[in-house]
Interface confidence: low
Amino acid sequence: DQDTGSWEQLVQARRSHKASPAAHLTGANSSSMGTGGPLLWETQLGLAFLRGLGYHDGALVTTQAGYYYIYSKVQLGGVGCPQGLATDLPVTHGLYKRTTRYPEELELLVSRRSPCGRAASSRVWWDSSFLGGVVHLEAGEEVVVRVLEEQLVRLRDGTRSYFGAFMV
Amino acid sequence: DQDTGSWEQLVQARRSHKASPAAHLTGANSSSMGTGGPLLWETQLGLAFLRGLGYHDGALVTTQAGYYYIYSKVQLGGVGCPQGLATDLPVTHGLYKRTTRYPEELELLVSRRSPCGRAASSRVWWDSSFLGGVVHLEAGEEVVVRVLEEQLVRLRDGTRSYFGAFMV
Amino acid sequence: DQDTGSWEQLVQARRSHKASPAAHLTGANSSSMGTGGPLLWETQLGLAFLRGLGYHDGALVTTQAGYYYIYSKVQLGGVGCPQGLATDLPVTHGLYKRTTRYPEELELLVSRRSPCGRAASSRVWWDSSFLGGVVHLEAGEEVVVRVLEEQLVRLRDGTRSYFGAFMV
């Protein structure tokens, strides 16, 4: 019975549990490039780490298929509303999947907020957006974070804006 | 090969999986002491529990090293803006680590919000802040929750403000 | 010693790890029925799945007892404030437990927000509410999501409003 498996399979289960994929990437000054691409992340310094997951150009890359809880938080802030950002234009924060099976990114988890309706034109305002949820990812698929209005993303020391995942 | 291990190690793996560390602590009337210290939590009553984690003076204390998904939600609320809390002064909600390696607390996950810019001076307003992310903790290290403007934290029955963790 | 167990128990531990309960349900046009009941969810199409958990009338149903990280996000939005929704009336988003042991639903995780205080009467506004936390559930217990002001929940393609859980 393939489900009962052998000693080797049990050992493998232990080994894989020991290295159950997980990652936490943190915001850095270079995270927001202003190029329309996904946010970029720190993978090693401070609180950032990769365990059983890869990283490439802003993307967490899976090395094994499975269900993953993926999450991201972005710290938003500004003084009044930046030019062209009316109070009825939302800030969109999302997690997106890239896969060889589709030519375009696939929306996974998305949030919209109207943060700068809170403040008068010259007032400083702050907001935070958190996303998290379980998705199935094949080996080699990539997940990225995008904030369309990336000029509003506030980075600092890696604790305000971050991106992570772990297998469930 | 230390990675293949023995029967005893496999049994240990099963035992530790069975008691994989997890906790969920809930807000109580005594959570906010107004002393400038971290928020305090209920550890046993109602929805609160500790499994493989300790508690001390507001802190979750690890008993084994590893990667933990730590999270906290705080319910914020007020009538207008409390004296001295201008709309451009954010409410800061954070998870912080205490370790023997550093004399001061280390920021792990932090969020800023400008919640009372939403309401006129005499209006009631509500906001909620959620934080969650994976961090590495050594055995004996502590994690606490702080809200600098703790007079704005609204407690009730343990469902609005809470703090938890589990090993990933 | 029951804790050390037998080969069969270790195999069973491996089998159960392989199918550790998890689910992610997504919002659909039929999620908000306007009946005062819980939100309803898509369980199969797109990003939605059930693994070791059941579904019934909006509820995730456990098949085995344990600690679960449960989560939900709802996308809120509107034009100004809907009639009867003053800026001091919060939007309440919560996760609730149904069990045969109690006649009424039990609050697990709850959040309150005052989102439409952000916008003038004719302005479009958006807000998002995320909840997540670890709770203990017995086999057969149910968890549902409620938003009392469900006319403000914005559904679209299953990425904006969702509901999930996994065993920790």
Epitope: N29, D157 | A65, T100, R101, P103, E104, H136, E138 | -
Partner: antibody
Framework: QVQLVESGGGLVKPGGSLRLSCAAS????????MSWIRQAPGKGLEWVSY???????YYSESVKGRFTISRDNAKNSLYLQMNSLRAEDTAVYYC??????????WGQGTLVTVSS | DIQMTQSPSSLSASVGDRVTITCRAS??????LAWFQQKPGKAPKSLIY???SLQSGVPSKFSGSGSGTDFTLTISSLQPEDFATYFC?????????FGPGTKVDIK
Amino acid sequence: QVQLVESGGGLVKPGGSLRLSCAASGFTFSDYYMSWIRQAPGKGLEWVSYISRSSFIYYSESVKGRFTISRDNAKNSLYLQMNSLRAEDTAVYYCARWELSPFDYWGQGTLVTVSS
Amino acid sequence: DIQMTQSPSSLSASVGDRVTITCRASQGISNYLAWFQQKPGKAPKSLIYAASSLQSGVPSKFSGSGSGTDFTLTISSLQPEDFATYFCQQYNTYPFTFGPGTKVDIK
């Protein structure tokens, strides 16, 4: 009193291997985080690797994949296995302990010379 | 990596002088900064941690200050045994990095 004594240094050819040891005494070794730091002749200090009480490990980019840090709490010893050595690895290697403050005590160092 | 710079790279001073050495981090490191003293042929010795906390057994003529990116080590009255090289080191993020050092010699 606190003592850290390094050993194992010497002359090695490029591509070769060495294993450094650090014997600790005068304190409860298992309670401390430990590091290796090196200093090339006439140059500044460079942190090499760190190992926590529970053997959680970090390396500098310059040695990652070539050096392995380990500890044996029962023997009060810290080790650095150095493989694929290069000329630029020539340095005095120090072990240092860390608890509340970083590197509060250092060993006297051991010289590693990589040359053909 | 966080780059640490020190100024001056060397200085000449007399016994009894007040000496100040500065250290700058390429990004904010809160107060996670240490200072070390090293004499020729010897291992470094810890003087200051957490930017301003005096290591046990270190005389109070040594003091540290600063937070964020700019830090200072001050020796209030230089003594013969203080002629050495001084290094700063950040331990806010991996990899831990040291400054290039400031050599204090006799004028």
